[in-house]
């Protein structure tokens, strides 16, 4: 049978020919009668055999990491007969490892983020090196990790490559660290190969700094003319943290928050001082407020860094503005009777300069030919007033500072013209009526009514009478209905068209004013032939036709 031991060849042998071992048949008595042959993978190119002795040699440098085993076949032939002495057999040549590969970090680049102020022992990252050498061959691929750079803040576990924090770090002092890790094979023994990697460790921010005002005093100014909501200046606190941890909120201490407010601009982290209530230089020309600042987000466990809020004092100076005159009232309403003579007193308006210099004021009434105003604000009539033409005047009074005519104020002035009884009542329309020749006594021929242009405090009441002449010698009479109307009645039987075709009746109408006014109004009454029907309609129709120039049969 075949006789051999297991074959090993060390990798990376530089000799031109390296003896591996011997293949032989136990029938071989050493007299060179047998011929040994090598077949299969690498036969002739990588491995050769001494045909006489069966000694096997490697004739090429081998790399275990490239190929670690070769399966070959061996034959032994009797030279004399040319026949196989043993059956063809497979055998294996294993390439044995040497420590020719350094550890390599395959997952580079390494980068880790860890919160600042993390306690000792906090895991940062694990780095892993791999070694192409045979892990089953001694310590060729057994690695030890060590820290070349990064003390005293970091440490590495020698066998796992786990990097941990060994000392608290403050991001505000240094926000990133380069750590250099070395991996050595042979568990660090002499002859070990090594590889290194760099790890960038970034510290993430925690809210361990409160915002602090860099200035203990801010001086701001505000114009007294500034409207509410006006931004009058900014204040700024600084927070060494970043991002969300540097977001802050400004506020005013409660006692000082009547006139001013502070809002936070979350983009710039500035405090904007705004006017909450209008200021008046003449009333108060300076203010002092205390502002405070706090972080927007503070986790409970970090409250120890935020016990007392930083404060600053803000002095605000009010700037004087030349303000227009100020009227005592927002508007004025005066009353004056109609028909009062020119120059009659209407009322007094008053405006003052709110500024400290107290400029004299000049007044004027815009667009009015009816009223005058003097420098004292006294308003008088410049024309006689007639309520029946205009009962109200809507005017505008302007006050102008004498020393600065650009400072003007205007307010409304309403003048009501009060009524006096200066109009007598009169017919509400022109009355012309008809009476038939054959009309009987007491026949109603017209109802009349009156109007009065005056305004009545109570209801108007009119009194109707015939004039003295008509009362004494009248074919007609009047009855007052007591409702501001009256009726005209015939006072006799029968009228004669030829003798007296028209009657003109004078009617007196008096009002209930004080003093009472009376007017005389003429009622025209036509006499007409009404026919048998006695209808005034017919009479009206006939008269109408006649008046139009038509002849009737």
């Amino acid at each position: 049978g075949w006789v051999w031991n297991q074959f090993f060849v060390p990798e990376e042998m530089n000799t031109t020919s390296h003896h591996i071992g011997q293949l032989r048949s136990d029938l071989d008595n050493g007299n060179n009668s047998f011929q040994y042959k090598l077949l299969g993978a690498g036969a002739g190119s990588t491995f050769i055999i001494d045909e006489r002795t069966g000694d096997i040699y490697a004739i090429q440098k081998l790399d275990r990491e490239e190929r670690s085993l070769y399966i070959l076949r061996a034959q032994v032939i009797d030279i004399a007969t040319g026949r196989a002495v043993e059956p063809e057999s497979e055998f294996v040549i294993k390439v044995s490892d040497i420590n020719d590969n350094e550890p390599k970090f395959l997952d580079e680049p390494y980068e880790a983020i860890v919160p600042e102020m993390s306690p000792e022992g906090t895991l940062v990252i694990q780095v892993t090196a791999s070694d192409a050498d045979d892990p089953s061959s001694g310590n060729n691929a057994r690695l030890l990790y060590s820290l070349l750079q990064g003390q005293p803040y970091f440490s590495v576990e020698p066998t796992t490559g786990v990097i941990r924090i060994s000392s608290k770090m403050d991001r505000e002092l240094q926000d990133e660290y380069w750590v250099i890790i070395q991996a050595k094979d042979m568990i660090g023994q002499p002859g070990a190969l090594s590889g290194t990697t760099s790890v960038l460790i970034k510290l993430s921010d925690v809210n361990d700094n409160k915002p602090i005002f860099k200035e203990s005093l801010y001086r701001l100014t505000v114009s007294e003319s500034a409207p509410t909501g006006t931004s009058i200046g900014t204040i700024m606190a600084y927070d060494n943290d970043i991002g969300e941890n540097a977001e802050m909120d400004y506020s005013i201490e409660e006692d000082d928050s009547q006139t001013f407010d502070i809002i936070t601009n979350h983009e710039t982290q500035e405090g904007i001082v705004i006017l909450k209530k209008k200021v008046d230089f003449e009333h108060q020309n300076h203010y002092g407020i205390r502002a405070k600042v706090k972080n927007h987000h503070v986790p409970e466990q970090l409250m120890k860094y935020h016990t007392e809020a930083s404060t600053t004092f803000i002095k605000i100076q009010v700037e004087d503005v030349d303000e227009p005159p100020l009227f005592l009232l927002p508007y004025y309403v005066f009353e004056v009777f109609e028909e009062t003579p020119q120059g009659s007193f209407v009322g007094v308006v008053s405006a003052t300069d709110p500024d400290n210099r107290k400029s004299p004021i000049r007044y004027s009434i815009t667009r009015s030919k009816v009223f005058n105003i003097n420098d004292n604000g006294t308003i008088t009539t410049s024309n006689s007033l007639d309520r029946e033409i205009s009962a109200w005047y809507n005017l505008s009074i302007t006050a102008t500072e004498k020393y600065n005519i650009e400072q003007i104020s205007s307010i409304p002035l309403y003048v009501q013209v009060l009524n006096i009884n200066d109009h007598a009542p009169e017919f509400s329309q022109y009355y012309e009526t008809y009476v038939c020749e054959n009309a009987g006594s007491g026949q109603v021929i017209q109802t009349i009514s009156a109007v009065d242009r005056d305004e009545s405090i109570e209801e108007h009441h009119f009194y109707f009478n015939l004039s003295v002449e008509d009362t004494n010698n009248s074919s007609f009479t009047i009855i007052d209905n007591q409702d501001n109307t009256a009726v005209i009645l015939t006072n006799r039987t029968g009228f004669n068209l030829q003798e007296e075709p028209v009657f003109y009746i004078s009617i007196l109408i008096a009002d209930n004013g004080i003093p009472s006014l009376t007017s005389t109004n003429t009622l025209t009454i036509h006499v007409c032939d009404c026919g048998d029907s006695g209808s005034t309609q017919t009479c009206q129709y006939q008269e109408l036709v006649l008046s139009m120039g038509f002849k009737t049969e």
Epitope: G40, D63, E66, R67, L69, E90
Partner: antibody
Amino acid sequence: QVQLQESGPGLVRPSQTLSLTCTVSGGSISSGGYYWSWIRQHPGKGLEWIGYIYYRGRTYYNPSLKSRVTISVDTSKNQFSLKLSSVTAADTAVYYCARVYSNYGWFDPWGQGTLVTVSS
Amino acid sequence: EIVLTQSPGTLSLSPGERATLSCRASQSVSSSYLAWYQQKPGQAPRLLIYGASSRATGIPDRFSGSGSGTDFTLTISRLEPEDFAVYYCQQYDTSPLTFGGGTKVEIK
């Protein structure tokens, strides 16, 4: 898992050099124990091994093509390449790249292949 | 150079039948160095068997390989519709690596 992808021109003029690249993804070309191989298949015919390379640069070629073949590796790009010079119409084939287990010699996995036509 | 001869060139069978494919080497090949591949039209070959008899990952157990020396066999115990393809053997024993000419298994 490891995947391979061939790339290169689909048409090459006669007498010119055919150049293909195989990009390896899902694993490192620098892993020990593997060869990175090129195989071709003439239309309607069988498979022909061209050669392979170890990532450290050692090459093994089919003697029938050795004079015209160069296989190279770029570990930084995780790629290996084939150059076949002085091509003729007989080099028209689908070219595959594949990973070879160095100890036992089987091909797995393979790229999907790219057809290269040699024509003027 | 080791020449691998595959037979038959074409095998016409019905689904469910048994397929036996032969690969003969021109000289002895270590069984550790013989592999079988399946190739479907328009696709790359796929490893089925390595070391003459070991199934690759994900290969159904209806595929089996055997043989040594110069004679190797691939058996498909019960043909499924997706098994109709071309099958190649390949050796790594002696350089250059070589493939057989292939056996086409087609539907009868």
